[in-house]
């Protein structure tokens, strides 16, 4: 025998009150699937969370942050506030990137600057707490009668700071 | 029930203060940090200032920083907002909001209705 929630669609939930019917979701609850016995609560963007998507009948709403939080976890369960460039977060809030260390985005850790010399390159650009280092060519490349000047190589695996 | 109540809202002239309270109950006040947020007309919701558990203040609002301050008062399971220097774009409704921690909320974080603050010029 066919269990007749099954042609219950998404939506709807198969009310045992009433012989089995199939009823529309409440307001503010959804089933995104067909069959359900029950719908769900829809979440509730609230405070710092913002909606992104409203709840329907058959999908639950979605949240994402308002400006100056950024998303964590799964379908965003979390809120994590941003820090400036040139900081990073610890558990007393933002603070700067130490001296030799540098985070380019408004989360994240600060990274120390690249070692060019571990490259055998000269650095060609100071770090800054915004900014990795730009290394140069190597002290080779720079001595007369070198040909060509070898362009910047793209920032490695972070070193140590410069000397 | 846990609950989150806003008070102290209202009409107030350019330059003037207020103190904005959230009185908390139903849960351990002393655990939580205590975070204000305002939505103005027409705009998105923004963080103005927090309180850790332990008492330290987090600006989320370079704007308010030299007006508004943050205090709680664990007896009083109460947070106050301290506004002075009001400005017109201060014109918003101020909610609180429960977090673990002033850098982390999350989606079952605890949250007030809100007070509205008017500041006309």
């Known amino acids: 025998l066919q269990d007749p929630c099954s042609n219950c669609p998404a939506g709807t939930f198969c009310d045992n009150n009433r012989n089995q019917i199939c009823s529309p979701c409440p307001p503010n609850s959804f089933s995104s699937a067909g069959g359900q016995r029950t719908c769900d609560i829809c979440r509730q963007c609230k405070g710092v969370f913002r909606t992104r998507k409203e709840c329907s009948s058959t999908s639950n709403a979605e949240c994402d942050c308002t400006p100056g939080f950024h998303c964590l976890g799964a379908g965003c369960s979390m809120c994590e506030q941003d820090c400036k460039q040139g900081q990073e977060l610890t558990k007393k809030g933002c603070k700067d990137c130490c001296f030799g260390t540098f985070n380019d985005q408004k989360r994240g850790i600060c990274r120390p600057w690249t070692n060019c010399s571990l490259d055998g390159k000269s650095v060609l650009v100071n770090g800054t707490k915004e900014r990795d280092v730009v290394c140069g060519p190597s002290p080779a490349d720079l001595s007369p009668g070198a040909s060509s000047v070898t362009p910047p190589a793209p920032a490695r695996e972070p070193g140590h700071s410069p000397q | 029930q846990v609950q989150l109540q806003e008070s102290g809202g209202g009409l107030v002239q350019v330059g003037g203060s207020l103190r904005l309270s959230c009185a908390a109950s139903?849960?351990?006040?002393?655990?939580?940090?205590i975070g204000w947020f305002r939505q103005a007309p027409g705009k998105e919701r923004e963080g103005v200032l927090c309180i850790s558990s332990s008492g330290g203040s987090t600006y989320y609002a370079d704007s308010v920083k030299g007006r508004f301050t943050i205090s709680r008062d664990n007896a009083k399971n109460t947070v106050y907002l301290q506004m002075t220097n009001l400005k017109p774009e201060d014109t918003a409704v101020y909610l609180c909001?429960?977090?673990?921690?002033?850098?982390?909320?999350?989606?079952?974080?605890?949250w007030g209705q809100g007070t509205q603050v008017t500041v006309s010029s």
């Open positions: 909001g429960a977090p673990r921690d002033c850098s982390r909320y999350s989606s079952d974080d605890y």
């Open positions: 139903g849960f351990t006040f002393d655990d939580y940090a």
